[in-house]
């Protein structure tokens, strides 16, 4: 009876999400393997988040709007482990917008989701950021490593979206 009601709840939750995400990929987790955590297909998952790499070249603002339509934001990177996971799926000759910007050019960097900007957990390439006119951040591969660079916001780039996992 308990299992039956849990399944019914899950099905109604799935139907609810179906209008936004035609397909979800779910895995069982939790100590009793009773919880399902899901990401839209073909997003990838790491810890409690889902990630989508957009190969559409767009400005930073348009990229963020595009993520927003999918219920996500441009990616906020909180740890080196998270960055290492993300970069496994990136092309080394491309650049991808992050959810990090400095709209006034005052070197007051801010994350799109209002996560506090912690200078101690940043992965700027050497010498970056280097221009107050370059107010948006990308991640790219340079000098044998992945790192961040400040670029012009209006210049189209690929991008990475991030959203919280869906729990059903």
């Amino acid at each position: 009876n308990f299992m039956y009601s849990k399944t019914v709840k899950r099905l109604s939750k799935l139907q609810e999400y179906q209008q936004y995400y035609p397909s979800l990929t779910c895995v069982m987790e939790g100590k009793d393997m009773e919880d399902w955590s899901c990401c839209p297909t073909p997003w990838t998952s790491f810890q409690s988040s889902c990630y989508f790499i957009s190969t559409v070249m767009q400005s930073w603002t348009k990229s963020q709007n595009n993520c927003s339509v999918m219920g996500a934001d441009l990616v906020v990177i909180n740890t080196k482990e998270e960055q290492d996971f993300i970069t496994q799926n990136l092309k080394i000759n491309s650049a991808y917008f992050l959810g990090l910007s400095d709209p006034k050019g005052w070197r007051h960097w801010q994350w799109v989701d209002q996560t506090p900007y912690n200078k101690n957990v940043t992965f700027w390439h050497s010498g970056e950021p280097n221009s107050p006119d370059e107010r948006c951040a990308i991640i790219n591969f340079r000098s044998e490593e992945w790192g961040w660079n400040d670029v012009h916001c209006h210049v189209p780039q690929k991008s990475i979206c991030k959203m919280k996992k869906i729990y059903i």
């Epitope: 767009q58 603002t61 709209p103 280097n130 221009s131 006119d133 916001c153 209006h154 210049v155 189209p156």
Partner: antibody, heavy 121, light 111 residues
Framework: EVQLVESGGGLVKPGGSLRLSCAAS????????MSWVRQAPGKRLEWVST????????YYPDSVKGRFTISRDNAKNSLYLQMNSLRAEDTAVYYC??????????????WGQGTTVTVSS | EIVLTQSPATLSLSPGERATLSCRAS??????????MHWYQQKPGQAPRLLIY???NLESGIPARFSGSGSETDFTLTISRLEPEDFAVYFC?????????FGGGTKVEIK
């Protein structure tokens, strides 16, 4: 006083080349992104190219990509536009303009008086 | 690219009258509180002159009779009382994404 003075325009045959120059004064030239914008007779203004302050980025619309090259010489306070394989549709007044970044975009706060380019056989 | 449509194409008014010029973008040129539309004035044989940046900010040295408003796709330039020197062509411009684009212009002429 900020001044931008263009030169180098003229009459050229289709397929020919021209090099436009823009002499800047009255401001720290190396600190600003610069653009070329053109205006064909009776048409709207059209952006032609941009070069960043540090010379690290150049941008072009598809209509001129591969034919036009923007460059700058910060020591001479000068901006250039090398135009090759010119077409009749490149006929226009060419303005150089200074860029000011504003939030996620930019605007042009000072413009030169323009130099006329006519492409005709 | 973002297409900017200005209306009317021509505005015939007398000195002292109020002028209201419209610029409509094919998609939003706003992001949160940033409205990335700018306005220029151009007189025959002259270079464009910046009037308003960021939809509503008056450029230094521009008379206070000029004002701008709007967000997303709809923007307005208002001249509260036309002076003889205000009869010219007015352009809007966006640069939220490359390529930066301009409107076709509104000509304000003496009635």
């Amino acid at each position: 006083e900020v001044q931008l003075v263009e030169s180098g325009g003229g009459l050229v045959k289709p397929g020919g080349s021209l090099r436009l120059s823009c002499a800047a004064s009255g401001f720290t030239f190396r600190s600003y992104g610069m653009s070329w914008v053109r205006q064909a007779p009776g048409k709207r203004l059209e952006w032609v190219s941009t070069i960043s302050s540090g010379d690290s980025y150049t941008y072009y619309p598809d209509s001129v990509k591969g034919r036009f090259t923007i460059s700058r010489d910060n020591a001479k306070n000068s901006l250039y536009l090398q135009m090759n394989s010119l077409r009749a549709e490149d006929t226009a007044v060419y303005y150089c303009a200074r860029q000011i970044y504003y939030d996620y975009a930019y605007y042009f706060d000072f413009w030169g008086q323009g130099t006329t380019v006519t492409v005709s056989s | 690219e973002i297409v900017l449509t200005q209306s009317p194409a021509t505005l015939s008014l007398s000195p002292g009258e109020r002028a209201t010029l419209s610029c409509r973008a094919s998609e939003s040129v706003s992001f949160r509180t940033s409205h990335l539309m700018h306005w220029y004035q151009q007189k025959p044989g002259q270079a464009p002159r910046l009037l308003i940046y960021g939809a509503s900010n008056l450029e230094s040295g521009i008379p206070a009779r000029f004002s701008g408003s709007g967000s997303e796709t709809d923007f307005t330039l208002t001249i509260s009382r036309l002076e003889p020197e205000d009869f010219a062509v007015y352009f809007c411009q966006q640069s939220i994404e490359d390529p930066p684009t301009f409107g076709g212009g509104t000509k304000v002429e003496i009635k």
